[in-house]
Interface confidence: medium
């Protein structure tokens, strides 16, 4: 138990969020970070993994409603599986219907997140900013 | 001390954020919430106050860098003081130079926050969405 050394007392009217990596955004007990540097999808994935996180997974419009106000385009963890035509998250789960509007803007097998729950298809080698996400237990 | 009844143990490698009102966004120990309903500036201010918060105050590009990615326009706590021509926050503090680019879009004494640290002057009676903020102690 040596990793745990802070005791925090929380008012009943409010709550703590997390835990998250330092200076990440915490919302509904998920952690998010927006990275400014442009990387291709694979580099972005590696960057998130190095921080014990993964590229953004959109799983709930309700739990992730902060995403509707995100400006610009950012890599998320959604990839196209040519063998069966589906869009899957990094963890292997299938994209749920009606969660994202997939827009066929470019030819590619990776997807950028854009505001209001849109996903833009993009070539995986194209550099873009990216969003990492860590689910708290 | 009766309000405090939760003890939380935090790993040293990560940290909790807050405390914040339930389901608010927590970032660098500030709490933020985006409200969808359109209200005029005064109603927006009252709504934030009723939640023990205030309209958004921009005080640091570094501590509030999540704001650069915010889409659309939202009331913040910045008002024009006609008697001396300055822009002040609700708490009476003067807007620091170089924090916001003030854009004179409309005639008015209130300001909307827009992405990349821009402030749009707007008539205070115009309904808009709004951002509430609560500084954690």
């Amino acid at each position: 138990n040596s990793l745990f050394n802070q005791e925090v007392q929380i008012p009943l009217t409010e709550s703590y969020c997390g835990p998250c990596p330092k200076n990440w955004i915490c919302y509904k007990n998920n952690c998010y970070q927006f990275f400014d540097e442009s990387k291709n999808w694979y580099e972005s994935q590696a960057s998130c993994m190095s921080q014990n996180a993964s590229l953004l997974k959109v799983y709930s419009k309700e739990d992730q409603d902060l995403l509707k106000l995100v400006k610009s385009y950012h890599w998320m963890g959604l990839v196209h599986i040519p063998t069966n035509g589906s869009w899957q998250w990094e963890d292997g789960s299938i994209l749920s219907p009606n969660l994202l509007t997939i827009i066929e803007m470019q030819k590619g097998d990776c997807a950028l997140y854009a505001s209001s729950f849109k996903g833009y298809i993009e070539n995986c080698s194209t550099p873009n900013t990216y969003i990492c996400m860590q689910r708290t237990v | 001390n009766s309000l405090f009844n939760q003890e939380v143990q935090i790993p040293l490698t990560e940290s909790y954020c807050g405390p914040c009102p339930k389901n608010w966004i927590c970032y660098k120990n500030n709490c933020y919430q985006f409200f969808d309903e359109s209200k005029n500036w005064y109603e927006s201010q009252a709504s934030c106050m009723s939640q023990n918060a205030s309209l958004l105050k921009v005080y640091s590009k570094e501590d509030q860098d999540l704001l650069k990615l915010v889409k659309s326009y939202h009331w913040m706590g910045l008002v024009h003081i006609p008697t001396n021509g300055s822009w002040q926050w609700e708490d009476g503090s003067i807007l620091s130079p170089n924090l916001l680019t003030i854009i004179e879009m409309q005639k008015g004494d209130c300001a909307l926050y827009a992405s990349s640290f821009k402030g749009y002057i707007e008539n205070c009676s115009t309904p808009n969405t709004y951002i509430c903020m609560q500084r954690t102690v």
Partner: antibody, heavy 121, light 107 residues
């Protein structure tokens, strides 16, 4: 890259017909194949689509109501549309189409020449 | 289902004219909209995808604009080969739906 259609013709009300679309010049198994129809003098109407790969995932327009069935044969690079319980309202030119890229399913840049189906007694 | 309303249903124009066709969705589809051209007896041809992206090989006199629910196809200077029917199609979600079409005829 092309789509070659076959199988149209005259059929009696209540009858059945199979339309097929042979793909050439590209890897059929990595693309969606879509079917669209156009009644004489009318607009375009989406019928449904099927993925050419192992899963054969399908999606249909609600009005199809089980009367039409999409299938594909990966080895033959062929997609087929089985039409059943046909009525005069199904009289139309039927097109197969392919998206512009394998990860697309809703934007079509390659079309078959069309095959006419006439339902009449 | 998303409904697409196209207008006008037909128009008469002369070579060199600027022609505008509009398409309206009954709900927000962002920029997930395609435009097709169809000549008599032929299959449709993709002109514009993602509301404003010009398909490879399509002349630059064709342009698309709009986002959300309102979209426009513009032909800046009508050429003889442009007399055809034009259809919009939403690419936001299944089932896919097309507009009713606009027939561009010679005046």
């Amino acid at each position: 890259q092309q789509l070659e259609q076959s199988g149209g013709g005259l059929v009696k009300p209540g009858g059945s017909l199979e339309l097929c679309c042979i793909a050439s010049g590209f890897d059929f198994s990595t693309y969606w194949m879509t079917w669209v129809r156009q009644a004489p003098g009318k607009g375009l109407e989406w019928i449904g689509c099927i993925h050419g790969g192992g899963s054969g995932t399908t999606s249909y327009a609600s009005w199809v109501n089980g009367r039409f069935t999409l299938s594909r044969d990966i080895d033959q690079s062929t997609g087929c549309l089985q039409l059943t319980s046909l009525t005069a309202a199904d009289t139309a030119m039927y097109y197969c189409a392919r998206p512009g890229y394998r990860s697309w399913s809703k934007t079509f840049d390659l079309w078959g020449q069309g095959t006419m189906v006439t339902v009449s007694s | 289902d998303i409904q697409m309303t196209q207008s006008p249903s037909s128009l008469s124009a002369s070579v060199g004219d600027r022609v505008t066709i509009t398409c309206q969705a009954n709900q927000d589809i962002s920029n997930a909209l395609n435009w097709y051209q169809q000549k008599p007896g032929k299959a449709p041809k993709l002109l514009i995808y993602a509301a404003s992206s010009l398909q490879s090989g399509v002349p630059s006199r064709f342009s698309g604009s709009g986002s959300g629910t309102d979209f426009t196809l513009t032909i800046s200077s009508l050429q003889p080969e442009d007399f055809a029917a034009y259809y919009c199609q939403q690419a936001a979600s299944f089932p896919l739906t097309f507009g009713g079409g606009t027939k561009v005829e010679i005046k």
